[in-house]
Interface confidence: low
């Protein structure tokens, strides 16, 4: 027989020789590291057929580490499932925790023993400061100075000085987020006032009102023979302007060889429209405009169009 | 100057075996995880094997395990991946690179070519 | 076929913002294990963009940054400049093999 076979977990006792005679036996014991457990053989003899008889080294078990608890608010989750040297044991906090320490520990081999590669981690409660204080309005909770993990705060504005109340612009409500920061900036406090918004040729169908404050909405519809050129819904944004801006109503051209049919009816309808000088982010038509001749606008058929697709 | 110098590229046949060094410069590899990653021409990159740093755990990709072996010596600085028995797939970009989960450091790479 | 999912290429025009998704399984990513970022510039080394998630190592801009949610995570880039053109590849780990994704090529237009 040539050489006999090596294995991961045993190791041949005396130095192998180039060739072995039939019926010569040679010996293994475990590596460093690994340990025996009867009654699985360690040795092999040379076969009449010039081969080594079965062998394995399964009777080997791998040094295993010592064992981990869970940290407190966290799981110690082995690699494989195993404690065995070679092997790692990660770590993972619950939800409202952060690791502080090593996410992963080796299980490593010092000598013949099996030791961790450090200290276990600890889950640390996520904690935040207080959140930003802003001009002219308040926060629950203020007089609070450490947020756990979802503690939410509630952001209202002062009552104003003048005429007009302070807006609340943004979002509310924030809360203490997984990383110990604020789910997001906190909102603003300001006074927004749009002006009244003036449609020659049309009229206001909602959103009545004398002063026009921050979400404030309102429609339009043109007048008979004139069509809406822009949104027929407008919102006051936090900038105190309208958007999309203010639209118009302009007149429908008579028909003629070049120009597109007149209208037995009103252009005016609550649905939303649009053309293309308005604004892209205003809503989508709800009607073929009846021009014909403004680019990306279907031509009319047989003179008629119809006020709703 | 914190740095991984790689030599030991070249054609080689078909059957045969290469040496990779990584010689690092401004730390030294035993207090750190080494591996090494190669990436195919015109191909993504490929995990190929990893050393522990106190050198006794080693970790194989399934497409080098019996063939390569990763090895280093702490009184060179320095990292080996031995490569017998190449093979047409193995040519490829070889990096070696430090550190544990993630790679903060990479050589600059060395090219393997397996060709008849 | 890489065990991580990313999308053959992006693009943006300067300015912009792109992201990148990573999609791995419940033995990867969705098994806890960190999520890092590669960013590879033509003809050089990779370097290491984010690491453990969503951290950024010194000297890279707080333009680049990750996300993990499940199995799958990201990474987005505001502000896109010329110079952010490479190809970016996300790595994770699942017992005993460190993962790549299939890489993702990054064109600004």
């Known amino acids: 027989c040539e050489e006999p076979p090596t294995f991961e977990a045993m190791e041949l006792i005396g130095k192998p020789k180039p060739y072995y005679e039939i019926g010569e036996r040679v010996d293994y014991k475990c590596k460093k590291g690994y340990f025996y457990i009867p009654p699985l053989a360690t040795h092999t003899i040379c076969d009449r057929n010039h081969t080594w008889l079965p062998v394995s080294d399964d009777a080997c078990y791998r040094e295993t580490c010592p064992y981990i608890r869970d940290p407190l608010n966290g799981q110690a989750v082995p690699a494989n499932g195993t404690y065995e040297f070679g092997y790692q044991m990660h770590f993972i906090c619950n939800e409202g925790y952060y690791l502080i320490g090593e996410e992963i520990l080796y299980c490593e081999l010092k000598g013949s023993v099996a030791i961790w590669s450090g200290k276990p981690p600890i889950c640390e409660k996520v904690l935040c400061t207080p959140p930003p204080k802003i001009k002219n309005g308040k926060h629950t909770f203020s007089e609070v100075e450490v947020f756990e993990y979802l503690d939410a705060v509630t952001y209202s504005c002062d009552p104003a000085p003048g005429p007009d109340p302070f807006s609340l612009i943004g979002e509310s409500t924030i809360y203490c987020g997984d990383n110990s920061v604020w789910s997001r900036a906190a909102p603003e406090c300001k006074v927004v006032k749009c002006r009244f918004p003036v449609v020659e040729n049309g009229k206001q169908i909602s959103g009545f009102g004398k002063k026009f404050y921050y979400k404030a909405t309102v429609m339009f519809e043109c007048d008979k023979g004139f069509y809406l050129d822009g949104s027929d819904t407008i919102v006051c944004d936090s900038n105190s302007t309208w958007d999309p801006p203010v639209p118009k109503c302009l007149k429908v051209l008579p028909p003629s060889s070049t120009k597109p049919p007149a209208l037995s009816h009103s252009v005016s309808t609550s649905s939303t429209t649009k053309s293309p000088a308005s604004s892209a982010s205003g809503p989508r038509p709800t009607y073929k405009p009846p021009v014909s001749n403004y680019p990306g606008y279907p031509k009319p058929e047989e003179g008629i169009l119809d006020s709703l697709d | 100057q914190v740095q991984l110098v790689q030599s030991g590229g070249g054609v080689v046949q078909p059957g045969r075996s290469l040496r990779l060094a990584c010689a690092a410069s401004?730390?030294?590899?035993?207090?750190?995880?080494m591996h090494w990653v190669r990436q195919a021409p015109g191909k993504g990159l490929e995990w190929v094997a990893v050393i522990s740093y106190d050198g006794n755990n080693k970790y194989y990709a399934d497409s080098v395990k019996g063939r390569f072996t990763i090895s280093r010596d702490n009184s060179k600085n320095t990292l080996y991946l031995q490569m017998n028995s190449l093979r047409a797939e193995d040519t490829a970009v070889y990096y070696c690179a430090k550190g544990g989960g993630y790679f903060d450091l990479w050589g600059r790479g060395t090219l393997v070519t397996v060709s008849s | 076929q890489s065990v991580l999912t990313q999308p053959p290429s992006v693009s943006g025009a300067p300015g912009q913002r792109v992201t990148i998704s990573c999609t791995g399984s419940s033995s990867n990513i969705g098994a806890g294990y960190d999520v890092h970022w590669y960013q590879q510039l033509p003809g050089t080394a990779p370097k290491l963009l984010i690491y453990g998630d969503n951290n950024r190592p010194s000297g890279v801009p707080d333009r680049f940054s990750g996300s993990k949610s499940g199995t799958s995570a990201s990474l987005a880039i505001t502000g896109l400049q010329a110079e952010d053109e490479a190809d970016y590849y996300c790595?994770?780990?699942?017992?005993?093999?460190?993962?790549f994704g299939g890489g993702t090529k990054l064109t600004v237009l």
């Open positions: 401004g730390f030294t590899v035993n207090n750190y995880a």
């Open positions: 790595s994770s780990y699942t017992s005993g093999t460190w993962l």
